[in-house]
Interface confidence: medium
């Protein structure tokens, strides 16, 4: 809306940088062959690049990433009883970001 | 995978709390009748509840919200020339979060 301008502060661009995000740990990251288990914790924090760039033709992208293995519980349900095992999930953290030109493929002439 | 357990730290649950997120300001928030304009900035930071709860039947939800009006530039393109106007967009910030029971509708018997 165009109303109530006086009370509104000028919007500040969300700069392109790393922010803490929540990553859902899906079961197929651990075992694609079996669905009869639960994962704990179901979500973890990761660092990810987000935000906008000063130009329409550029995009906020990770310029440096780090893989971080973490242990989760794989809770298998066998005959209605749980069996607790450890599993390793590798998370991707973004360490640095940059505004990168979007390369659009040229049409073939 | 169940390999390389030694190097991996135990995963820590992403607790239910407010985190800084990036909100894309879509054009239809400003004017649904006209697509012939740009918005600046294209994205801003907001506070939003995210994360997981310690229980299967609960979900991380906002328990307190605040509406925050911000001024953006509406850049209309008229005869290939830009016309700058102000517009107000109301953002929703989450101030507090809680793990709330998911109410699943009971089947009608």
């Amino acid at each position: 809306s165009l109303g109530s301008l006086a009370a509104a502060e000028p919007a500040v661009i969300a700069e392109c940088k790393t922010r803490t995000e929540v990553f859902q740990i899906s079961r197929n990251l651990i075992d694609r062959t079996n669905a009869n288990f639960l994962v704990w914790p179901p979500c973890v924090e990761v660092q990810r690049c987000s935000g906008c760039c000063n130009n329409r033709n550029v995009q906020c992208r990770a310029s440096q990433v780090q893989m971080r293995p973490v242990q989760v519980r794989k809770i298998e349900i066998v005959r209605k009883k749980p069996i607790f095992k450890k599993a390793t999930v590798t998370l991707e953290d973004h360490l640095a970001c940059k505004c990168e030109t979007i390369v659009t493929p040229r049409p073939v002439t | 995978s169940l390999g390389s357990l030694a190097a991996a730290e135990p995963a820590v649950i992403a607790e239910c709390k407010t985190r800084t997120e990036v909100f894309q300001i879509s054009r239809n928030l400003i004017d649904r009748t006209n697509a012939n304009f740009l918005v600046w900035p294209p994205c801003v930071e907001v506070q939003r509840c995210s994360g997981c709860c310690n229980n299967r039947n609960v979900q991380c939800r906002a328990s307190q919200v605040q509406m925050r009006p911000v001024q953006v530039r509406k850049i209309e393109i008229v005869r290939k020339k830009p016309i700058f106007k102000k517009a107000t967009v109301t953002l929703e910030d989450h101030l507090a979060c809680k793990c709330e029971t998911i109410v699943t509708p009971r089947p009608v018997t």
Epitope: L38, I83 | P10, C99
Partner: antibody, heavy 120, light 107 residues
Framework: EVQLLQSGGGLVKPGGSLRLSCAAS????????MSWVRQAPGKGLEWVSY????????YYADSVKGRFTISRDNSKNTLYLQMNSLRAEDTAVYYC?????????????WGQGTLVTVSS | SYELTQPPSVSVSPGQTASITCSGD??????VHWYQQKPGQSPVLVIY???KRPSGIPERFSGSNSGNTATLTISGTQAMDEADYYC?????????FGGGTKLTVLG
């Protein structure tokens, strides 16, 4: 204050019954799994029974299976252990304890313990 | 049934490092927790998920777990650390405790 307050212990004859209670306060009881753990005089800790947050899952140590029943009343914030057909070897201090998650995990809060003596 | 084995006793001089082991078949595949119990008191969680420390537990307590052995390490042991220590793991639908280790702080 976050605590577990136990009651119901005492002296009982072999073959007799007893019900232990564990009243929770200071936290949302219905969000946590609970267990009973016992300790015979001068001995180590022995896990007895587990119940999930909503009471749908219950597990028992082989030594008490068929004789002990774990239950909970989330509306009263209370955990119970019904002990039947008691034997001399059930003599122990019984602790109720809280798991931080619905599925179990470590025991992060313990009751003060209550002594159960089975003797004729 | 699954068994966890601990040494009955460990002695250490004040200020030294005490290590208490807990062994079980493929124990590294399970999360191990450690409890401290002083005479006449309820147990207290000191390490969970192999190596995590609950709030309020001093930094001198640490843990590790791989292969068939989990270890509780107390660095700079103090007289107040004298207690019984129990390892625990949730395996096949039951919580299993080790037999316990009596830690004696000499002097």
């Amino acid at each position: 204050e976050v605590q577990l307050l136990q009651s119901g212990g005492g002296l009982v004859k072999p073959g007799g019954s007893l019900r232990l209670s564990c009243a929770a306060s200071g936290f949302t009881f219905s969000s946590y799994a609970m267990s009973w753990v016992r300790q015979a005089p001068g001995k180590g800790l022995e896990w007895v029974s587990y119940i999930s947050d909503d009471g749908s899952l219950k597990y028992y140590a082989d030594s008490v299976k068929g004789r002990f029943t774990i239950s909970r009343d989330n509306s009263k914030n209370t955990l119970y252990l019904q002990m039947n057909s008691l034997r001399a070897e059930d003599t122990a201090v019984y602790y109720c304890a809280r798991h931080p998650y619905w599925y179990g995990g470590q025991l992060d809060l313990w009751g003060q313990g209550t002594l159960v003596t089975v003797s004729s | 049934s699954y068994e966890l084995t601990q040494p009955p006793s460990v002695s250490v001089s004040p200020g030294q490092t005490a290590s208490i082991t807990c062994s079980g078949d493929s124990l590294g595949s399970y999360f191990v927790h450690w409890y401290q119990q002083k005479p006449g008191q309820s147990p207290v969680l000191v390490i969970y998920d192999d190596s995590k420390r609950p709030s309020g537990i001093p930094e001198r307590f640490s843990g590790s777990n791989s292969g068939n052995t989990a270890t509780l390490t107390i660095s700079g042991t103090q007289a107040m650390d004298e207690a019984d220590y129990y390892c625990s793991a949730f395996t096949h639908n039951s919580d299993v405790f080790g037999g316990g280790t009596k830690l004696t702080v000499l002097g």
